[in-house]
Every structure is written in structure tokens, then in C-alpha cells.
């Protein structure tokens, strides 16, 4: 009977452009939030976030792998990628006080989901959740969460870049996280 | 000719660990908030908020069920799971007497989505938004998003839980809700 | 031998209600931002964006269109649906003032998404986020998450609209963005 | 109450194999790893494996990666060690622990429940 | 791998005196490394966790510090059922591996 078609398995108005696959063996990672070691960065450059990958509720699987705060892309296509970063700070100083230190510009937090392609030199932004912070209380907290839909390629590499690493709460798997997977 | 593999259908260098199943046929909820009743909870415990699953846009499909507060997951698999609450409050009265009544303690809101195996009395969180509340408006509102992918077992239920049961919109379907999908 | 059925490849517990089709194939878009042009809208309506489709991280694929502020549901199904809009403001004027203006109201920032189908006039609103605001700093920025999984039908249309399209960050395509797929 | 119980040790042959079983309750299986450790008569403790019942990643002590198979059963809230090409120097008393992990990035927890051991002997 | 060593092996005291255990590993560990209480017979129980948390249940005489390289298992006042075998476990790289452990001995 020689290869059979995906399409035959398809209605006939149907066009399949694509061989059937199972969804059981598609590329996926959950990763969850770890103690961050300070690292050097340059001035206008944001530090990437490292990951927990295998404990608790986080796993890779199907040749998705984590590697030195990059998820690595096993298989080119359409990706859902997200992540939520819960910021914690104190801002006990009143805020015309730190407004004075930080003139026209207000204190802020950032997320950025990064693509890296190794033949291209710049990164690419895929994600960006920013929000300036006039918190009045003592102690501020919230998160910023991020998720869409990125066309990939073999061989991209993911990573969450944050506006400032020390604001991080990196005290439950819950709080911060960053995930991929094949639709 | 026997029974066809799956794998005959995907391209030589590609592994197929799972049998090929429809989309269509795939676990699937959308849940949307309705009014609350208030119920006892203890002190330190969140409590769980209940939804409406037929009504308007909701829906639970393919032997996902609704029961109880709970969302029962019918077949072990990698879910995303997803849910907005909007609270709205009022803080008439200045922000230094409530932070008299409540010292050291910036008030905040809180959601957590939550996972229940019946042969293990404690809940697993899965993910949590966490947010001070520093508004000095006489009212205030403002939703907080959650979304990943996780690993459940059958028989596993999801619930959500909040900080003050009280605070929650219930007045829109589409600013309250709760939701899950086989991937 | 005919054309044999998809659930030959499912394991015999198991029921497939539809037929196997590729995932390559299925209805997808991501559109980013892109500057408003000022628009005529009924006082208590709210404006839709209009968006890009096709430039940078921005694509349409398998039958999902993008025309005239709308995505156009090729085909009937469960679809993801999500959106980031990003705002922007300045509130140089003292709180008090701002709130004379408005009586009783606070400022506020919404974004939903709502479908249209031709065949009913009125359209459905699916998500909402809606969040006061209370900044006391000159300038502010924040962003509003939306997901959620939806049953749509052929021909049916998403657009997103905001509160106040003048407050739209237009300035990246990682900033605000709106994006279906179907599950 | 959380609980552990190995079994499966026994008497085998040089070039034999044995699979042991834990089987765990009182807690949710899913969420901590569990491991395999060894202690060789008069000896010290020895990691063997490790396997995320969440997501079924695994681990081996480098002596012993080819030879020893860990695997899992959530249905079952079961946990498995295959051991193939035994030799004299396997001979020990086979412990599964649960790897507390506290759900928080400040933490890497440590093996807060075992079982009470059963032992393998390779002899000939 | 990561080896790890214990000092002393063997260790004579007295109930009441102060017993200090020492662990040392050929590479950082930053803070991961457990502590293990093990008694003829027995199965090993954890004591401490993350270089200085104590475990559910465990006496606040026992106590942890030390990260990267250096560690140290302190029992304030040894009682008697402290007399046993102590074992420390890095868990920052795979493979985990234990010391060869400590025995703490009535003099």
C-alpha cells in the first residue's frame, strides 16, 4: 500500500501540511525560581534569571533542555512561552525623596523574554512586562507575568531578563517561574 | 495489512512516544466566576472560590468536571491552567490608620491555584500572585493573572484559592475565571 | 482497504470523538502594536486596536486573518486567546485635583477582548482586565495581561479594545500584543 | 503517616539481576523525588539514583549508570530499581528516601523520609 | 563528582560536652548540604538541611553552618542517644555524595 498520508486520516476539506504527531512527545519545560547569585552585567543590559529544572514542580522533557539560564529549542515551531517574576522591595524613604535621587524617572520593574539565535548577533525581545512602582507603603510586592505565541527554530535559546535581580522573590516555586511548549 | 503504527506517519528521524490522539476529544474547562457564598475557613487558610461551569462562556468538556469548587482532572497529562481574579475594594480611610490596624503589614491581595491529591491531605500550590494593595483612591480595583503548565495525575483536582473572599468581582464573567486544557 | 479511521491508532480504552489532524496546520496569529490612529467611538464604547500582522515577531498562518482591527476565525474550535496591552500616563497634577474632575470615580485602565459574530448584533465580551489608578509619581507605565480558552465558531472575529487608546505603549511590539491559537 | 517500604532484596548470583520496590503513602507521590541509597556491610552510605516522580528525570551514581535502571509508578505510588549484572560489591542493605524539596528557591531540601532497607546479597 | 569529607573519623566525648563535626567538599557547594543522623540498625535520619535548617522534629541542640566549602554539624550538649554515625551530603551537583561519615563515640 506504500506511505500512507496524514491526510487520508483528515475530512476531505481539510488540508494537513504537517505529519501527524503524538502531543505526548513534544518539547516542554516548566522551570521555577532559585537563590540568584549577583552576577557582573553591564550598565544598560539586563541580568538573566537562573532556574530550577528538575525539582519540585519544575521538569524539561523531550529534549528540551535548560542549560546556564538558557532553555535550549530541541525543534523548530510554534511556541507558547511565558513566565510570571514576582518583585518584592522596601521603599520606607517617602517618594519625593527618592523621586529627588531618580529625577524624572520613577522607580520601575521589567521582564524581558529573550530570544538568542547563535548565527544572530542581537538578541531579540520577544516578551516585555514593565511597570513603574510608587508603591507608598513600607513593603511593596507583585508580580509581572508574561505569555504569548513565538515561532522558533532549532537551536534558539530562551532566557528571562529582569530590570534588577536583588527585587526578585525567590522564596516559593510559585511565585516566579518561566515556561515553553510546543503547541 | 494489522494495526497501523503512528509513528509510520511521522518523518524517519522524528520518535513517536505516545499514541496518536485527536485534539477534539482532549480535557477542557473554562470556568467563570459567579457570587460568592461566604463560608468558614481557618484563620491562615485561603478560601476557595466556587464557579460557574455552563453557563455563558463556561464550559468543562471531554470528562473534565466541575464538582464542588474543584475541577477534577479525568486523564494524567501536561495541563496549562490559567486563571484571573479581579478583586476591587475601598480604602476610604487614610492609609496611616489602616496601617495602624495593621502594623508592619502592607495590605495585599492573593490568589493561588491549587492542587488536591486525594491520598495526601496537604495541597500542593502551583502558582500564586501575590500583591500589596497601597491605593490611596476611595476605590480600587485590579485583577491579577496566572498561567503555566504542569504535570497531573487522574483524579488530581485544581481549585483557586484567594486572601479575602470579599474583595472578588463576581460582577462579570469575564473578569473572574478559571480554566484548564490538555496540551 | 478503504480510508481507514483515526482512532485505529488510539488505544482501545480510549474514544476519539474527532479526527487526527496535524498541529502545523491549525489557525495561529500573533500581532504586535502599532501606532493608533485616532478614531471616532461612541461615548461609552470602547476603541479597538489595530495592529500589525505580518512585520517583525507579528505572522497569521493556516487560514487565520488579520483585516480591519479584526482576527477571523477560520475554523470552529477551542482557541486560546491572549493579549498585553501596555499603558502609559502622566498625573502631574496632585490626586486631588484628578479626583475633583471625576467624582466619585477613580481613573482608571481597561482592555478586553471581544468577539463578534455577524449573525448577532451585540458582541461578547470574553476578557476583561480593568485596573484602577492611583500613581503618584509624574509618570506611570503598566501592563494588563489577558488568557483565557474559548469555543469558537467559523466567522467569528476577536479584537481587543481599551479605555483610552491615547494611553496605548505603541513603542514596541514586546509590549503589547494580541494573539490566538486554536487548541 | 508518611511511609515508605522497600522489598525485593534477596539472595542472587554474580551476573544476576533483582528489582526492588518502594512503595510510598501519606504523602503526594508526585511532587517529591525519591532516591536510592546503599550501605555495603560496615560501610558508610552511598547515593545510587534519583528519579522525579513529577516528571520521571533520573540520575545515577557514575559506577553505576548502565548496570541499574530507576523507575516509577504514580498509579501505583511505586518506585523501582532495576539491578542487572550484579556483583559481589552490590551487596548492601538498599534504602529508598523521599527527597524533601520545600517548594522554595532558597532551598534544596534533603532525604527527610526512608525506608527501613532490604538488603541484596550477591554471592555465588 | 564532588567528593566530600568528613573530619575526625571517630570522635570520644562525653555526655554534656560540645561535639563539633567537620565536612569539607573538593568543590563550593554554596549552601546545599544535608546533615544525617544514622544509629546501629537504623536507617539514616536527616538532620539538618541547606547547610543550617533543621529538620521537622529535631532538637534545637543540633545545629549547621558553613557554605561553599566548609561546613560543620555542632551538637551543643550531647545526650545520650546522640552517640551514633554522622553523614554529610552535598545535593549542588549531581551526582548527591555522601562523606564517609563521622562516629561519634562515649569516651
Known amino acids: 500500500m506504500g506511505a500512507l498520508k496524514g491526510q487520508e486520516f483528515a475530512p476531505s476539506h481539510q488540508q494537513v501540511y504537517a505529519p501527524l504527531r503524538a502531543d505526548g512527545d513534544k518539547p516542554r519545560a516548566h522551570l521555577t525560581v532559585v537563590r540568584q547569585t549577583p552576577t557582573q552585567h553591564f550598565k544598560n543590559q539586563f541580568p538573566a534569571l537562573h532556574w530550577e529544572h528538575e525539582l519540585g514542580l519544575a521538569f524539561t522533557k523531550n529534549r528540551m533542555n535548560y542549560t546556564n539560564k538558557f532553555l535550549l529549542i530541541p525543534e523548530s515551531g510554534d511556541y507558547f512561552i511565558y513566565s510570571q517574576v514576582t518583585f518584592r522591595g522596601m521603599t520606607s524613604e517617602s517618594s519625593e525623596i527618592r523621586q529627588a535621587g531618580r529625577p524624572n524617572k520613577p522607580d520601575s520593574i521589567t521582564v524581558v523574554i529573550t530570544k538568542v539565535t547563535d548565527s544572530y548577533p542581537e538578541p531579540t525581545q520577544l516578551l516585555m512586562g514593565t511597570k513603574s512602582v510608587s508603591e507608598v507603603g513600607s513593603n511593596w510586592f507583585q508580580p509581572i507575568y508574561l505569555g504569548a505565541m513565538f515561532s522558533l527554530q532549532e537551536g534558539d535559546k530562551l532566557m528571562v531578563n529582569v530590570s534588577d535581580i536583588s527585587l526578585v522573590d525567590y522564596t516559593k516555586e510559585d511565585k516566579t517561574f518561566f515556561g515553553a511548549f510546543l503547541l | 495489512m494489522g494495526a497501523l503504527k503512528g509513528q509510520e506517519f511521522a518523518p524517519s528521524h522524528q520518535q513517536v512516544y505516545a499514541p496518536l490522539r485527536a485534539d477534539g476529544d482532549k480535557p477542557r474547562a473554562h470556568l467563570t466566576v459567579v457570587r460568592q457564598t461566604p463560608t468558614q475557613h481557618f484563620k491562615n487558610q485561603f478560601p476557595a472560590l466556587h464557579w460557574e461551569h455552563e453557563l455563558g462562556l463556561a464550559f468543562t468538556k471531554n470528562r473534565m468536571n466541575y464538582t464542588n469548587k474543584f475541577l477534577l482532572i479525568p486523564e494524567s497529562g501536561d495541563y496549562f491552567i490559567y486563571s484571573q481574579v479581579t478583586f476591587r475594594g475601598m480604602t476610604s480611610e487614610s492609609s496611616e490608620i489602616r496601617q495602624a490596624g495593621r502594623p508592619n503589614k502592607p495590605d495585599s491581595i492573593t490568589v493561588v491555584i491549587t492542587k488536591v491529591t486525594d491520598s495526601y491531605p496537604e495541597p500542593t500550590q502551583l502558582l500564586m500572585g501575590t500583591k500589596s494593595v497601597s491605593e490611596v483612591g476611595s476605590n480600587w480595583f485590579q485583577p491579577i493573572y496566572l498561567g503555566a503548565m504542569f504535570s497531573l495525575q487522574e483524579g488530581d483536582k485544581l481549585m483557586v484559592n484567594v486572601s479575602d473572599i470579599s474583595l472578588v468581582d463576581y460582577t462579570k464573567e469575564d473578569k473572574t475565571f478559571f480554566g484548564a486544557f490538555l496540551l | 482497504m478503504g480510508a481507514l479511521k483515526g482512532q485505529e491508532f488510539a488505544p482501545s480504552h480510549q474514544q476519539v470523538y474527532a479526527p487526527l489532524r496535524a498541529d502545523g496546520d491549525k489557525p495561529r496569529a500573533h500581532l504586535t502594536v502599532v501606532r493608533q490612529t485616532p478614531t471616532q467611538h461612541f461615548k461609552n464604547q470602547f476603541p479597538a486596536l489595530h495592529w500589525e500582522h505580518e512585520l517583525g515577531l507579528a505572522f497569521t498562518k493556516n487560514r487565520m486573518n488579520y483585516t480591519n482591527k479584526f482576527l477571523l476565525i477560520p475554523e470552529s474550535g477551542d482557541y486560546f486567546i491572549y493579549s498585553q496591552v501596555t499603558f502609559r500616563g502622566m498625573t502631574s497634577e496632585s490626586s486631588e485635583i484628578r479626583q475633583a474632575g471625576r467624582p466619585n470615580k477613580p481613573d482608571s485602565i481597561t482592555v478586553v477582548i471581544t468577539k463578534v459574530t455577524d449573525s448577532y448584533p451585540e458582541p461578547t465580551q470574553l476578557l476583561m482586565g480593568t485596573k484602577s489608578v492611583s500613581e503618584v509619581g509624574s509618570n506611570w507605565f503598566q501592563p494588563i495581561y489577558l488568557g483565557a480558552m474559548f469555543s469558537l465558531q467559523e466567522g467569528d472575529k476577536l479584537m481587543v479594545n481599551v479605555s483610552d487608546i491615547s494611553l496605548v505603549d505603541y513603542t514596541k511590539e514586546d509590549k503589547t500584543f494580541f494573539g490566538a491559537f486554536l487548541l | 503517616e508518611v511511609q515508605l517500604v522497600e522489598s525485593g532484596g534477596g539472595l542472587v548470583q554474580p551476573g544476576g539481576s533483582l528489582r526492588l520496590s518502594c512503595a510510598a503513602s501519606?504523602?503526594?507521590?508526585?511532587?517529591?523525588?525519591i532516591s536510592w541509597v546503599r550501605q555495603a556491610p560496615g560501610k558508610g552510605l552511598e547515593w545510587v539514583a534519583w528519579i522525579s516522580t513529577y516528571n520521571g528525570n533520573t540520575h545515577y551514581a557514575r559506577m553505576l549508570q548502565g548496570r541499574f535502571t530507576i523507575s516509577r509508578d504514580n498509579a501505583k505510588n511505586s518506585l523501582y530499581l532495576q539491578m542487572n549484572s550484579l556483583r559481589a560489591e552490590d551487596t548492601a542493605v538498599y534504602y529508598c528516601?523521599?527527597?524533601?524539596?520545600?517548594?522554595?528557591?532558597?532551598?534544596?531540601?534533603?532525604?527527610?523520609?526512608w525506608g527501613q532497607g532490604t538488603t541484596v546479597t550477591v554471592s555465588s | 563528582e564532588i567528593v566530600m569529607t568528613q573530619s575526625p573519623a571517630t570522635l570520644s566525648l562525653s555526655p554534656g560536652e560540645r561535639a563539633t563535626l567537620s565536612c569539607r567538599a573538593s568543590q563550593s557547594v554554596s549552601s546545599y548540604l544535608a546533615w544525617y543522623q544514622q544509629k546501629p540498625g537504623q536507617a539514616p535520619r536527616l538532620l539538618i538541611y541547606d547547610a543550617s535548617n533543621r529538620a521537622t522534629g529535631i532538637p534545637a541542640r543540633f545545629s549547621g553552618s558553613g557554605s561553599g566549602t566548609d561546613f560543620t554539624l555542632t551538637i551543643s550538649s550531647l545526650q545520650p542517644e546522640d552517640f551514633a554515625v554522622y553523614y554529610c551530603?552535598?545535593?549542588?551537583?549531581?551526582?548527591?555524595?555522601f562523606g564517609q561519615g563521622t562516629k561519634v563515640e562515649i569516651k
Open positions: 551530603q552535598q545535593r549542588s551537583n549531581w551526582p548527591w555524595t
Open positions: 528516601a523521599r527527597e524533601n524539596y520545600y517548594g522554595s528557591g532558597a532551598y534544596r531540601g534533603g532525604m527527610d523520609v
Open positions: 501519606g504523602y503526594d507521590f508526585t511532587y517529591y523525588g
